[in-house]
């Protein structure tokens, strides 16, 4: 198949990746579709280093992430491991809280203003951020 | 000039099947999600499904979900809905628009003339 | 499903007229709504897109507004090729809905 040689316009290249930045929110799902449609995924932090770059980006912004647990563990949406891979979280989260009677837990990770990680409503409109990475493969079939 | 011709359009009996088409030119097709959206005679606009540049992600209005399905083949430059198990309500004139990506949405830049499908016995 | 509605269904008005469409959405759509116009027999053109931004060569007698689950498009100066249906569509959500229209016809 084609390879994505290059970042889109108005998208960010990083370490051979392609970020795009929302100024507006969305639910985390209408998020995911979005970046989805994009051919792309909400973004899936990996390492110290892309925390750092995509906290760089976002500014103190809460911002939905590709990470959420609503059908159980924690999973991202690449399908990179949770459980040994990078993790940021603030002291106590994920906490599932209950308390902010919008009904149910908190399913969805999004960064704080410090960057740090929260689990929160995943219907809060917050700003979110895509990722597609280079030279990865597309589903066109190979020209003949 | 961004061009976009459907074809495929006609009168079938319910229940049966029907391919449309969409052939693009002057834009970058592999580089924007493709729609379709339907007008039944006299009513308003009715949106059926989108495809992602790459063909890897696909939406549905949940009336065609299981009976429609949206594909492309970006070597030909050329969208494509299959339709099956159609019914009297699937009547109407079936626009492929191209879904710009705008901000954080997508919306419909430009539009086909569109195809009538006629679903009778 | 978020719905959309559209008052008033249709409008009679002059040349030079002010004509002014609201749309709203069932639920908060945070901004994601665009604006169509379509003539008979002709597929519809997108006029604007969040909420206010203008869609390259259209008219700037053509304006949008609003937030939350109220928006507004307003032509300040009706002309004669501005006689046609307008729809509202959000793209907040899956699946996608338009509003039912509203016809601007000459008075």
């Known amino acids: 198949g084609s390879e994505r040689t290059c970042c889109p316009v108005n998208w960010v290249e990083h370490e051979r990746s392609c970020y795009w930045f929302s100024r507006s929110g969305k639910a985390w799902a209408d998020a995911d579709n979005y970046c989805r449609l994009e051919d792309a995924h909400l973004v899936v932090v990996t390492s110290w280093e892309e925390q750092k770059f995509v906290q760089h980006h976002i500014g103190p912004v809460n911002t939905w992430m590709g990470l959420h647990d609503q059908n159980g563990p924690w999973k991202w949406v690449d399908g990179t491991d949770y459980e040994t891979g990078f993790k940021n979280w603030r002291p106590e989260q994920p906490d599932d809280w209950y308390g902010h009677g919008l009904g149910g837990g908190e399913d969805c990770a999004h960064f704080t203003d410090d960057g740090r990680w929260n689990d929160d409503v995943c219907q809060r409109p917050y700003r979110w951020v895509c990722e597609t990475e280079l030279d990865k493969a597309s589903q066109e079939p190979p020209l003949l | 000039e961004v061009q976009l011709l459907e074809s495929g359009g006609g009168l079938v009996q319910p229940g049966g099947s029907l391919r449309l088409s969409c052939a693009a030119s002057?834009?970058?097709?592999?580089?924007?999600?493709m729609s379709w959206v339907r007008q039944a005679p006299g009513k308003g606009l009715d949106w059926v499904s989108v495809?992602?540049?790459?063909?890897?992600?696909?939406f549905y209005a949940d009336s065609v979900k299981g009976r429609f399905t949206i594909s492309r083949d970006n070597s030909k430059s050329t969208l494509y809905l299959q339709m099956n198990s159609l019914r009297a309500e699937d009547t109407a004139v079936y626009y492929c628009?191209?879904?710009?990506?705008?901000?954080?949405?997508?919306?419909?830049?430009?539009w086909g003339q569109g195809t009538l499908v006629t679903v009778s016995s | 499903d978020i719905q959309m509605t559209q008052s008033p269904s249709s409008v009679s008005a002059s040349v030079g007229d002010r004509v002014t469409i609201t749309c709203r959405a069932s639920?908060?759509?945070?901004?994601?709504l665009a604006w169509y116009q379509q003539k008979p027999g002709k597929a519809p053109k997108l006029l604007i897109y969040?909420?206010?931004s203008l869609q390259s060569g259209v008219p700037s007698r053509f304006s949008g507004s609003g937030s939350g689950t109220d928006f507004t498009l307003t032509i300040s100066s009706l002309q004669p090729e501005d006689f046609a249906t307008y729809y509202c569509?959000?793209?907040?959500?899956?699946?996608?809905?338009f509003g039912p229209g509203t016809k601007v016809d000459i008075k």
């Open positions: 628009a191209s879904a710009i990506a705008a901000a954080g949405a997508h919306y419909f830049d430009y």
């Open positions: 639920r908060d759509i945070n901004g994601w």
């Open positions: 969040t909420v206010s």
């Open positions: 495809i992602s540049g790459s063909g890897g992600s696909t």
């Open positions: 002057g834009f970058t097709f592999s580089s924007y999600a």
């Open positions: 569509q959000q793209s907040n959500s899956f699946p996608f809905t």
